[in-house]
């Protein structure tokens, strides 16, 4: 038997993916475990194999369909179970009635690009990925810029309280290398959380013009 504290957390990306993490103190590393998804209103079910991500936690992605298909709505409730093999039997380790639109985490923004760069400012754009059309403008973003000699954790957060897929960074230092990241969150959902940060976009500001003698 597996003892210890269990934690089972899942998020819906608003389209066709439910990502789950199961952590269990004292769990056996070599145990084969799966997440089973049974929607209450739909005649499909889905399974994914939990793979270790750390000493006592496992993760997997339930792929419900093609990336941009709308597989669930706010009416759906999905029963999610962690099932682990014990000999020839499967044992249920965790269960939750999952409300997809109360537990949202979108995919990280993609296609970051520098639209225009100057000595002290840089205009950057991005796109959201695999987000339900349901949200329309009801999204917010956070962005951060990595300056030389600092860490991402030290970077101040810039908040965009609307669906705005661009930003103009000001007061930058000329001829300096920066990196930029952005993340997105829907306004809906009691347990909704921020998407992962986007892949960093590296850019360099233009050098200051040389003064005349």
């Amino acid at each position: 038997a597996v003892n210890g504290t269990s934690r089972f957390t899942c998020f819906y990306n608003s389209r066709a993916n439910i990502s789950c993490v199961w952590s269990q103190d004292g769990a056996l590393q070599d145990t084969s475990c799966q997440v089973h998804a049974w929607p209450d209103r739909r005649r499909w079910n889905q399974t994914c194999e939990l793979l270790p991500v750390s000493q006592a936690s496992w993760a997997c992605n339930l792929i419900l369909g093609t990336p941009d298909s709308q597989k669930l709505t706010a009416v759906d409730i999905v029963t999610l179970r962690v099932m682990c093999r014990e000999g020839v039997r499967w044992r249920m380790m965790a269960i939750q009635d999952f409300k997809p639109f109360e537990n949202l985490r979108l995919m990280a923004p993609i296609s970051l690009q520098v639209v225009h760069v100057e000595t002290h400012r840089c205009n950057i754009s991005w796109k959201i990925s695999q987000a339900s059309h349901y949200f329309e403008r009801h999204l917010e973003f956070e962005a951060r810029t990595l300056s030389p000699g600092h860490t991402w954790e030290e970077a101040p957060l810039m908040t965009l309280k609307q669906k705005q897929e661009w930003i103009c960074l000001e007061t930058l230092t000329p001829d300096t290398q920066y990196e930029f990241q952005v993340r997105v969150k829907p306004l809906q959902g009691e347990f909704t959380t921020w998407s992962p940060w986007s892949q960093p976009l590296a850019f360099r500001t233009k050098p200051a013009a040389l003064g005349k003698d």
Partner: antibody, heavy 120, light 106 residues
Framework: EVQLVESGGGLVQPGGSLRLSCAAS????????MSWVRQAPGKGLEWIGE????????NYAPSLKDRFTISRDNAKNSLYLQMNSLRAEDTAVYYC?????????????WGQGTTVTVSS | DIQMTQSPSSLSASVGDRVTITCSAS?????MHWYQQKPGKAPKRWIY???KLASGVPSRFSGSGSGTEFTLTISSLQPEDFATYYC?????????FGGGTKVEIK
């Protein structure tokens, strides 16, 4: 061919009760959510409630849940609507409807309806 | 509950006319569905998931929209299209219907 046939309608006095039935055929009834929807004379459609395949989940329109009860018998391929404490405003054609989905959820088949008249 | 408002409630049009029916939801919905109903008959699923035509529905029908505003369009009205059309959402419980749009012959 999917068929839904309602029965049990008729004239009933205010305060009375009536039990409507919906006989399903042409599909695996035990796998589908089902709903009751009504339509008052000359009016629009009003959802009454729904029941899931194994009867473990039954939801009602808030205004009707105290007087109406939905049930089903998968062995008989039948859906039921028990209506109590009937009022004049319950006069309507009552339809049973099957749920289906592609991405969103909708009603894909409807019965022909059964008429309930509440009058003294 | 999400309230659905259809406009117009009725319209008179001639065969060959282009007809547009609008459905406004009081809150955002993921999809809108449309049903056709003829007098004395049960409703029929007509358009689902906002823009997909049910089996047997002629291609002169189309559906569009997102958020809170949705439309059903008939590009060239035919005699068999005279009926009442209802919109319906099921993005949250309870499912709700619009009040209907009656398409009559001018």
């Amino acid at each position: 061919e999917v068929q839904l046939v309602e029965s049990g309608g008729g004239l009933v006095q205010p305060g009375g009760s009536l039990r409507l039935s919906c006989a399903a055929s042409g599909f695996d009834f035990s796998r589908y959510w089902m709903s009751w929807v009504r339509q008052a004379p000359g009016k629009g459609l009003e959802w009454i409630g729904e029941i899931n395949p194994d009867s473990s989940t039954i939801n009602y329109a808030p205004s009707l849940k105290d007087r109406f009860t939905i049930s089903r018998d998968n062995a008989k391929n039948s859906l039921y609507l028990q209506m109590n404490s009937l009022r004049a405003e319950d006069t309507a054609v009552y339809y049973c409807a099957r749920h289906d989905y592609d991405e969103g959820i909708y009603f894909d088949y409807w019965g022909q309806g059964t008429t309930v008249t509440v009058s003294s | 509950d999400i309230q659905m408002t259809q406009s117009p409630s009725s319209l008179s049009a001639s065969v060959g006319d282009r007809v547009t029916i609008t459905c406004s939801a009081s809150s955002r919905v993921i999809y809108m569905h449309w049903y056709q109903q003829k007098p004395g008959k049960a409703p029929k699923r007509w358009i689902y998931d906002t823009s997909k035509l049910a089996s047997g529905v002629p291609s002169r029908f189309s559906g569009s929209g997102s958020g809170t505003e949705f439309t059903l369009t008939i590009s060239s009205l035919q005699p068999e299209d005279f009926a009442t059309y209802y919109c319906q959402q099921w993005s949250s419980n309870p499912p709700t219907f619009g009040g209907g749009t009656k398409v009559e012959i001018k």
